[in-house]
């Protein structure tokens, strides 16, 4: 048995005389051979749900739902009623109904089992029944909303008449219908004005029916016509079987440069008609295995289920429907050298389906991993300038398909063939499997005889230990300059344009701090600053290279604070900024201010 | 009718262990909160312990917590008291009561045994 | 820990006296208060819970007022059955609180 709301309304007056009946509460079955049994609780409550009194007032008929006056509510009664509630005014009170017998917590109201009845108060006696509109003859203040279970019997779940207006006015003929279009599984009686299902429903046919309620109230010679909403909301049940869209029920799958953990190889998706179980329950209740197959399939794969709701046409209208992502997930990271190709199976359950038919699918994933070979391009040419300062970037090495690869670790090394000209070093970028290569030693690059530097680049996968070789061949450009006296270390530090490209700094290729013009356009990501390399500093990510040293790139590396307007990098550095951002990285402070407009003039004045 | 008789108290000595147990009829025992409360002789009364409805959760007055360990069995109607490191000022009458609830507020307890003797003497 | 101090400690009448107890918490416990009676031997009975809600099957007699950090209950019209120990529990917040109590004896 099931409430067909959760709430009910109705007004109270007072010195409302006892007898009066108030409304009718309705309960629909479960199955054909239940009985509805009413049972009011002890206590009447106010507003935020505290309780104020036992109930003396109101008493309910067990069999037929019917709510009704045992007692007069007056003026004291309403007071005492008012005091208790800590303090707020009382303008409402409900009860609570339960169905019995009922598996309930008492102290909880919950739909199915349980429905609040609200009684707004009116603290004087019933109005002239010539006094009242056609709307409050016709329907309570507050529009009711229905919630029908679907396959269930049929049975009545609301009645029109006010009960208090038809017993206190019965002189009013007020009469009511349902609009509804054909065809359609209401129907209201015309002498009982009960509404009632014709027969069972199907929410996977239609989930809401956006009725419209008619009523016509005769008054003497008066006709007036009234119509409201009257929604029904059809209830899930778990009567539909898993299918596989388009029938497909097999994913391939080729695995080689993503190795990773948690990389999603394939994907299936699974179509429910239902929307339940819901949400909270659902991964519980819906379950997926991988079936048994070898051991290192079992360790090397898992199922992730991602439920999601969707909607569908039926009938014209559209309902709600779930599909399940089933994605075959790596459950670690994948040697290079592994090379196997297998068939995988998934069993997917959907529990609380009761048929007819099974509620379970088997998903096919066929997968093949393929080994990786690590190649590197037989020789790499470059050229790095005299001037250029230490933890410059002046190329990257990359075995082939690196920018691919993820969950595969390959470590460059670099091997100098002169000893003294050993001037570069190699860092590896996490992001993209390459090797950064950098001005380690400044000292050796302004030698005249290291013109021309020759390494052997090694790669190394650090799972299997295979490797790559390649010759690389620097070739060492112009002539070292001298920097002029008092710059500082790091290129950041400048503020202006004109002294920012009179220094270098750590990080500089060409021994020459470069400055970024911003656009000017508030808080920006392009704003201006001075940097060693405008093409990785800043870029709004704090690099291998950039991490070795904070005077390099503190825009993107800097953990310290940040004043004036910005918005933070994550997880450090400026993200975005102000005008124009300068950084002392000693004192681990960057400043984003307003641009100097003073500058460009008092440069043309000076000239 | 609704009924909580308690059990299972009686001499003990200073750090030696108790276990009191609660019966209860007459109303849907895994519905509703239950507490532990005891008086002393000649003394008022003070709160020991709370379990929630379903077990989820409980909490302890400071001069038990540590010491004593509430306790239901939802299947068997039962309320537990493990009373461990028993001392001199544990000795009383220690009463089981149901907790009213209802709502989302507490309004006390409403149902209240008729309490068994613990006495911790060397 | 919210403290409850409860007045009198014991207080004397006669049959047919107006009697008043005093609750008064450390803290604002929001109505959230009830008032227990205790006769030798036996165990608690509610008698008012919510600062003024009266019990199922409690006269009239009694009842209870009171918000914030102040509670009162007031035996209209004492009857013999009403000598007894009388205390006073905050049910706001765990851990919850009895008051000392009040002895009301016969004069």
């Known amino acids: 048995l099931y409430f067909s709301r959760d709430a009910y309304w109705e007004k109270l007056y007072v010195d409302q005389a006892a007898g009066t009946p108030l409304l009718y509460v309705h309960a629909l079955r479960d199955a054909p051979e239940e009985v509805p049994s009413f049972r009011l609780g002890q206590h009447l409550y106010g507003t935020y749900r505290t309780r104020l009194h036992e109930n003396n007032w109101i008493c309910i008929q067990e069999d037929t739902g019917l709510l009704y006056l045992n007692r007069s509510l007056d003026h004291s009664s309403w007071e005492k009623l008012s005091v208790r509630n800590r303090g707020f005014p009382l303008l409402t009170v409900y009860l609570k109904v339960f169905l019995s017998p009922t598996s309930l917590r008492e102290g909880e109201c919950q739909w199915p089992g349980c429905a609040r009845v609200y009684f707004s108060f009116f603290n004087t006696s019933f109005p002239a029944c010539s006094s009242l509109k056609p709307r409050e003859l016709c329907f309570p203040e507050t529009r009711p909303s229905f919630r029908i279970r679907e396959n269930r019997p049929p049975g009545t779940f609301h009645q029109f008449r006010l009960l208090p207006v038809q017993f206190l006015c019965p002189n009013i003929s007020v009469a009511y219908r349902l609009l509804e279009g054909e065809g359609l599984p209401f129907r209201c009686a015309p002498d009982s004005l009960e509404v009632s299902t014709r027969w069972a429903l199907d929410r996977e046919q239609r989930e809401k029916y956006e009725l419209v309620a008619v009523c016509t109230v005769h008054a003497g010679a008066r006709e007036e016509v009234v119509m409201v909403p009257f929604p029904v909301t059809v209830y899930d049940e778990d009567d539909s079987a898993p299918t596989f869209p388009a029938g497909v029920d097999t994913a391939s799958a080729v695995v080689e440069f993503k190795r990773k953990e948690d990389t999603v190889v394939a994907t299936l998706r699974v179509f429910d008609a239902d929307v339940v179980p819901a949400s909270g329950e659902l991964v519980r209740r819906y379950t997926s295995t991988l079936l048994p197959g070898d051991t290192w399939a079992q360790q090397t794969f898992r199922v992730e289920h991602w439920p999601n709701e969707t909607s569908v046409q039926a009938n014209g209208s559209f309902v709600r429907a779930t599909v399940h992502d089933y994605r075959l997930v790596l459950n670690r990271n994948l040697s290079i050298s592994e090379n196997r190709t297998m068939q995988l199976a998934v069993l997917v359950n959907d529990s609380d389906f009761q048929g007819p038919g099974a509620g379970v699918l088997l998903l096919h994933f066929n997968v093949s991993v393929l080994p990786v070979s690590l190649h590197l391009p037989s020789t790499y040419s470059l050229s790095v300038s005299r001037r250029a300062r230490r933890f410059a970037q002046i190329g990257k090495v990359c075995v082939e398909n690196c920018q691919a690869f993820s969950g595969i670790n390959v470590q460059y090394k670099l091997h100098s063939s002169g000893a003294n000209c050993s001037t570069l070093g190699v860092v590896t970028s996490a992001e993209d499997t390459s090797g950064i290569l950098f001005v380690n030693d400044t000292k050796a690059l302004r030698r005249p005889k290291c013109a021309e530097l020759h390494y052997m680049v090694v790669a190394t996968d650090q799972q299997t230990s295979r490797q790559a070789q390649a010759q690389l061949l620097v070739t060492v450009e112009g002539s070292y300059v001298a920097e002029e006296a008092g710059c500082p270390l790091s290129c950041a530090v400048s503020k202006r344009r004109l002294e920012c490209e009179e220094c270098g700094g750590l990080g500089s290729p060409t021994g020459r701090c470069e400055w970024r013009q911003g656009d000017g356009k508030g808080i920006t990501r392009n704003f201006s600053t001075c940097s060693p390399s405008t093409k990785t500093c800043p870029d709004g990510h704090c690099d291998v290279v950039e991490t070795q040293d904070i005077n390099i790139c503190p825009q993107d590396c800097l953990r310290g604070s940040i004043v004036g307007g910005h918005e933070p990098g994550e997880p450090r550095g400026i993200k975005a900024g102000y005008g124009t951002c300068n950084c002392f990285p000693e004192e681990e402070k960057c400043f984003c201010e307003p641009e100097d407009i003073q500058d460009p003039l008092c440069d043309e004045l000076c000239r | 009718q609704v009924q909580l008789v308690e059990s299972g108290g009686g001499v003990v000595q200073p750090g030696r262990s108790l276990r009191l147990s609660c019966a209860a009829s007459?109303?849907?025992?895994?519905?509703?909160?239950m507490h532990w409360v005891r008086q002393a002789p000649g003394k008022g009364l003070e709160w020991v312990a709370v379990?929630?409805?379903?077990?989820?959760?409980?909490y302890y007055a400071d001069s038990v917590k540590g010491r004593f360990i509430i306790s239901r069995d939802n299947s068997k109607s039962t309320l537990y008291l493990e009373m461990n490191s028993l001392r001199a000022e544990d000795t009383a009458l220690y009463y089981c009561?149901?907790?009213?609830?209802?709502?989302?507020?507490?309004?006390?307890?409403?149902?209240w045994g008729q309490g068994t003797t613990v006495t911790v003497s060397s | 820990d919210i403290q409850m101090t409860q007045s009198p400690s014991s207080l004397f009448a006669s049959v047919g006296d107006r009697v008043t107890i005093t609750c008064r918490a450390s803290?604002?416990?929001?109505?959230?208060l009830g008032w227990y009676q205790q006769k030798p031997g036996k165990a608690p009975k509610r008698l008012i819970y919510?600062?003024?809600i009266l019990e199922s099957g409690v006269p009239s007699r009694f009842s209870g007022s009171g918000s914030g950090t102040e509670y009162t209950l007031t035996i209209s019209t004492l009857q013999s059955e009403d000598f007894a120990i009388y205390y006073c529990?905050?049910?706001?917040?765990?851990?919850?609180?009895f008051g000392q109590g009040t002895k009301v004896e016969i004069k």
């Open positions: 803290q604002d416990i929001r109505y959230d």
């Open positions: 007459g109303f849907s025992f895994s519905s509703y909160g």
């Open positions: 529990l905050q049910h706001n917040s765990f851990p919850w609180t």
């Open positions: 919510a600062s003024s």
């Open positions: 009561a149901r907790e009213d609830w209802d709502e989302g507020y507490y309004y006390g307890m409403d149902v």
């Open positions: 379990m929630w409805y379903d077990g989820s959760n409980e």
